[in-house]
């Protein structure tokens, strides 16, 4: 499939352009040693022709060596000469009179991704029906363009939504920020698994996955190896660890001899139980109370400590 | 186990074109980019092309560039590159590779272009 | 673009003995984020390229620590102890420091 160009010489439109030509685009990346051919061909080949470049305005003319014009293939120049411009288009005087080629866009490409990040990155502990919102962002280099892809258990979801956008980065900022959000609305057992999401430049990829566990519905259970007896000697410190598996995590009250216990400088009743310095009154029945904030559901376990003076 | 099979290599003549493909299995195809790299009769290295992994953003070697067109299709795992306007030095075994972190760290066994009149 | 020059052949080894490849860069090849973007393949007679080595110095997944990476900003050294049978083959380093990314003209390891 051969080409054929026929020049007619017109001193009064000395540039070529394409009837569907309104403005071009010059892709280019910042290298010191790649040059880029803007191109404005011309229908003369011994133009005197002039390359200008907006905003601020620059003008470069052929010197010889990594500057030229060539009517068959356009003004050449090094790419980071013209990385600060917006606009670019070749200038050429004929008898006085100024002519210009078509405008030509100048887009900066980047590739390089410094990383991905996942939100939340891990313990993602959903129940049937509930809303998954996963947020991927990609930090990369200035001028790059970022496509995002997710797999995850069913990527065939009916009711999944992704929204891809750049993120305001700080003015004299040396990065860029890309979000993709994934959002299944009414999360099923089907869902559960890994999510991965991946970002690329076309030069570059990175990826970052996070596991996602669907319950069947609320629920609150203690773990194994809670325990049932703690012995301890006067003047240690004793940790009793209320041991659950939950969703979404219960609310845990202590009580001893059925009486509620508050937090204080001897005490610390949270997800375990601490007595800072243990007497011989602390000896008793501990009770710890589980109550799943979304169902109300109550699972309670008894802890008898005996306090040995030595 | 990560398979890439490369196919469509063939004999053309200078000025014609080829369609190569890419197979991929045993791996997640959507979340890795994907390039061309072949390999010329003096056993040279040369990266050809590159695409994201949703297809929109493409590289070209300034070699190949407005001649040759990479393009992938996911839904069936498949990476493709167009070549036209075929000359006696894009010769070569065309390798696709997998990319990640700018890394090819799986390539196919190759498939063999001839351009010759 | 950037040049990767290396050496046809490699100096002659002995099956068990220890060996250095070298591969040099026209340009640095340490980025601003402060990683060495190099990496090593190696092709066995037959086979396509394995990735031994990245960010010059990081071996690859499966990849034997009989390998190790090494080097400056433009100089670089793949280094094999031990070399066995299966390390026949030519080693290719390449930059990924700057677009479009290019590789060595490959080192071919000479058995004694």
């Known amino acids: 499939a051969s080409v054929i160009y026929v020049y007619v010489q017109d001193y009064r439109s000395p540039f070529i352009a394409s009837v569907s030509d309104q403005h071009g685009v010059v892709y280019i990346t910042e290298n010191k040693n790649k040059t880029v051919v803007i191109p404005c061909l011309g229908s003369i080949s011994n133009l005197n022709v002039s390359l200008c470049a907006r905003y601020p305005e620059k003008r470069f003319v052929p010197d010889g060596n990594r500057i030229s014009w060539d009517s068959k293939k356009g003004f050449t120049i090094p790419s980071y000469m013209i990385s600060y411009a917006g606009m670019v288009f070749c200038e050429a005087k004929i008898n006085d009179e100024s002519y210009q080629s078509i405008m030509y866009i100048v887009v900066v490409v980047g590739y390089r991704i410094y990383d991905v990040v996942l939100s939340p990155s891990h313990g993602i502990e959903l129940s049937v029906g509930e809303k998954l919102v996963l947020n991927c962002t990609a930090r990369t280099e200035l001028n790059v363009g970022i496509d995002f892809n997710w797999e995850y258990p069913s990527s065939k979801h009916q009711h999944k939504k992704l929204v891809n956008r750049d993120l305001k980065t700080q003015s004299g900022s040396e990065m860029k920020k890309f979000l993709s959000t994934l959002t299944i609305d009414g999360v099923t057992r089907s869902d559960q698994g890994l999510y991965t999401c991946a970002a690329s430049s076309g030069l570059m990829t990175k990826k970052n996955s996070t596991f996602v566990r669907v319950h069947e519905k609320p629920f609150v259970a203690f773990g194994s190896g809670m325990e049932s007896l703690v012995e301890a000697t006067v003047g240690e410190r004793v940790r009793i660890p209320a041991k659950y598996l939950g969703y979404p995590p219960p609310e845990i009250k202590w009580y001893k001899n059925g009486i509620p216990l508050e937090s204080n400088h001897t005490i610390k009743a949270g997800h375990v139980l601490t007595i800072m310095e243990v007497s011989e009154r602390d000896t008793g029945n501990y009770t710890v109370i589980l109550t799943n904030p979304i169902s109300k559901e109550k699972q309670s376990h008894v802890v008898s400590l005996v306090v040995y003076v030595p | 186990e990560v398979q890439l099979v490369e196919s469509g290599g063939d004999l053309v003549k200078p000025g014609g074109s080829l369609k190569l493909s890419c197979t991929a299995s045993g791996f997640s195809f959507s979340i890795y980019g994907m390039s061309w790299v072949r390999q010329t009769p003096d056993k040279r290295l040369e990266w050809v092309a590159s695409?994201?992994?949703?297809?929109?953003?493409?590289y070209y070697a300034d070699s190949v560039e407005g001649r040759f067109t990479i393009s992938r299709e996911n839904a069936k795992n498949t990476l493709y590159l167009q070549m036209n306007s075929l000359k006696s030095e894009d010769t070569a075994l065309y390798y696709c590779?997998?990319?990640?972190?700018?890394?090819?760290?799986?390539w196919g066994q190759g498939t063999s272009l001839t351009v010759s009149s | 673009d950037i040049v990767i020059t290396q050496n046809e052949l490699s100096n002659p080894v002995t099956f068990g003995e220890s060996v250095s490849i070298s591969c040099r860069s026209s340009?640095?090849?340490?980025?601003?984020?402060?990683?060495?973007?190099l990496n090593w393949f190696l092709q066995r007679p037959g086979q396509s390229p394995q990735l031994l080595i990245y960010l010059m110095s990081t071996r690859a997944s499966g990849v034997s620590d009989r390998f190790s990476g090494s080097g400056s900003g433009t100089d670089f050294t793949l280094e094999i102890s031990r070399v066995k049978a299966e390390d026949v083959g030519v080693y290719y380093c390449q930059q990924l420091v700057e677009y479009p990314f290019t590789f060595g003209s490959g080192t071919k390891l000479e058995i004694k």
């Open positions: 695409i994201s992994v949703g297809g929109s953003y493409t």
């Open positions: 590779a997998r990319e990640l972190d700018g890394n090819y760290d799986y």
């Open positions: 340009k640095s090849l340490l980025y601003k984020d402060g990683k060495t973007y």
